[in-house]
Structure formats: C-alpha cells, structure tokens
C-alpha cells in the first residue's frame, strides 16, 4: 500500500527580501527517502531538480537551491515538490521572493528571516497534481 506523502516545506536563506546581486538559497524539506526535490517557479513550467538530498533531522531530508546573484527577474513565487518513489508529493505553500535595490533607502524593508510559514507564503494551487518523474525529462525552462 502506498504511503501518504507529507507536503514539503520551503524556506529561504538568509530571507525572502534579497538585495539585488546578493545570493539566496531556497531550502526544501520532506521525509526521509526523497530521491528528487524540485523547486518550481510561479508555475510548473519552470523548475530545477536536485538529487543532492541530505538529512535535516532523523525524520526529514532537505535539498538546497542557490541563486548566486539575484536579479530582478528572480522575484516571484516559488514552491517545492519532491519525488519519493513511486510518486510525487503535493506542492508546498508558495514562498514569495522580493528583490530590492542594493542601495537600500530608509524606507526599504530589512531582509526577513527565512521561514517555512512566514507572511510571504501563499497557499499553493493543488487542483492539478500530475507530475512525471524527473528521469522522464520534462521540458522546462530552468530557474537560473
């Protein structure tokens, strides 16, 4: 009998408001046994996969997706999904990445700490959850 897969979580380090040109790392978390984590951008047509999965705790695995130099075009909604054979999980909530001018005037927001349940997350649309394994090579733009 197939197990019910818990939804993944997503967070961002060092936060969700990133100065232009700085780096950000998205962290996806799921259960032990995940083979592929996928970071999706805005819609499922743009994504990056990784099999570099490591332990986050005795009961959790995680993967990290790093953008070395954030551009304005990187702003947007991100979410995670994972493949634990024989199926894909549901998507995580959305995390919104905001990109600010690096000069940073007095009114510009400070970098928010990374959070898997912060105010920049939006519920994901799980109305269509058909995903093929990464090994089948879905055509998609890459995030970076």
């Amino acid at each position: 009998q197939e197990e019910d897969l818990p939804r993944p979580s997503i967070s961002a380090e060092p936060g969700t408001v990133i100065p232009l040109g700085s780096h950000v790392t998205f962290v996806c978390r799921g259960p032990v046994g995940v083979q592929t984590f996928r970071l999706e951008r805005d819609s499922r047509s743009t994504y990056n996969d990784t099999e570099d999965v490591s332990q986050a705790s005795p009961s959790e695995s995680e993967a990290r997706f790093r953008i070395d130099s954030v551009r304005e075009g990187n702003a947007g909604l991100y979410r995670c999904i994972y493949y634990k054979p024989p199926k894909w999980s549901e998507q995580s909530d959305y995390l919104e990445l905001l990109v600010k001018e690096s000069s940073g005037g007095p009114d510009s927001p400070d970098t928010e700490p990374g959070s898997s349940a912060g105010p920049t997350q939006r519920p994901s649309d799980n109305s269509h959850n058909e995903h093929a394994p990464a090994s089948q090579g879905l055509k998609a733009e890459h995030l970076y």
């Epitope: 099999e51 570099d52 790093r66």
Partner: antibody, heavy 117, light 107 residues
C-alpha cells in the same frame, strides 16, 4: 541507463600518488552529490569521500583514514568525478568505486589500487 | 562518528528458509539506513533505502524494518542467488559508515 566508469587504478609505491577518475553518464550529474567507496581485498565496504553540488558549495567530506591525503573533486561540465590520492599507504590497497547519491543507488565497476613496494 | 554493528557476520540457511540480519547504530539515525547486496567479484547493489523502501527492481522477498538505532533486514524464501554478502550503511551523517557485512551460506 546510468553508467559510472572508474579509471586510473594501478600499482603504486608507498608514499606515492594516484588520481582516479569516474566518467558519469545516463543521469544529471551536476544535480547529484557523488561518493567514493572502497573495499580492501576480502574485506568489507568503507566509505571514503563525498562531494556535494554547486548549490551546496561543492562541500566535501572525508573518512578519517584518508583526511589530509585524499582530495575529491568534480567537473560538472564533463560529468567527471576525481579522487586525488597522495602519500599512499599499503592499507589503501582496495577496489575503489564511484557511487551516486542520494542513497548510494548507482555504483561503477570499480578500479583496483595496489600500494606495494 | 556513528558506528554500525551488523550481525551475524555469517549465517547458514537452506533454500526456501527466511533469514534476518540486524544492524545497530551507535546513535539514533532515524530511518537513514540502506541495505546492499554484493555478489563475488561484483559491485554492491542497493536493495533497501530509508530503512524500509525497496529499491527499483528489487524482489519483494527482501524487506527492511526499524528506526532509531535498531534495524532489521529480512529475506523470505531464500533463492540460490541470495547466498552472497549483505551490508548495512547509515546515511545520516558523514562518515557514512557501513556495517561489517554478513555472508549467507547454503546449509
């Protein structure tokens, strides 16, 4: 189909050096952490080293027995994994396997390193 | 470092029987455990990952159980090709240590 092909093994004298290579194909190499595992003749398996992906800053990890003597590296553009072995000891004699993660799923056929005077 | 103690080192059994191998971790590793089979002169093959998940193409007579520090690996209804060596490995933290191995022999 996944293929991992190790090369570079051979006979080397104690305190000598050797560089092993592993050519990967059939999977997305640059999104996989990679490992070296060895097995001395008639003995069990020993994990040697691991290198993570670019998103993890190519972090490296080593067994205590090889720390400061062995260096793991990778070339994502060529889908190649390497193990530079310096100051070799007789106890480094083993079959060396290139192994993909996350769960040591795919193994190469191995390359034999013999350290002997 | 996490030590993995695998037992027995060798075991004799008959065709059709069941055998169980145990692996004990020196500290809790959740379910970050894998089991491998190795045939003479061949590379190891992943059988079980995440303590209980069967790898692709592995027959269902192989199974894994356990979490925390105690893990078991069972082969039900032994076939002739199963009389080889088996290893556990913890994947929780580096160094990713293996158990000492178990050699199955035909009784």
């Amino acid at each position: 189909e996944v293929h991992l092909v190790e090369t570079g093994g051979g006979l080397v004298q104690p305190k000598g050096s050797l560089k092993l290579s592993c050519a990967a194909s059939g999977f997305n190499f640059n999104t996989n952490a990679m490992n070296w595992v060895r097995q001395a003749p008639g003995k069990g398996l020993e994990w040697v080293a691991r290198i993570r992906t670019k998103s993890n800053n190519y972090a490296t990890y080593y067994a205590d027995s090889v720390k400061d003597r062995f260096t793991i590296s990778r070339d994502d553009s060529q889908s190649m994994l390497y193990l530079q072995m310096n100051n070799l000891k007789t106890e480094d004699t083993a079959m060396y396997y290139c192994v993909s993660t996350p769960y040591f799923t795919y193994w190469g056929q191995g390359t034999l390193v013999t350290v002997s005077a | 470092d996490i030590q993995m103690t695998q037992s027995p080192a060798s075991q004799s059994a008959s065709l059709g029987e069941s055998v169980t191998i145990t692996c004990l971790a020196s500290q809790t590793i959740g379910t970050w455990l894998a089991w491998f089979q190795q045939k003479p002169g061949k590379s190891p093959q992943l059988l079980i990952y995440a303590a209980t998940s069967l790898a692709d193409g592995v027959p269902s007579r192989f199974s894994g159980s356990g979490s925390g520090t105690k893990f078991s690996f069972k082969i039900s209804s032994l076939q002739a090709e199963d009389f080889v060596s088996y290893y556990c490995q913890q994947l929780y933290s580096a160094p990713y240590t293996f158990g000492g191995g178990t050699k199955l022999e035909i009784k």
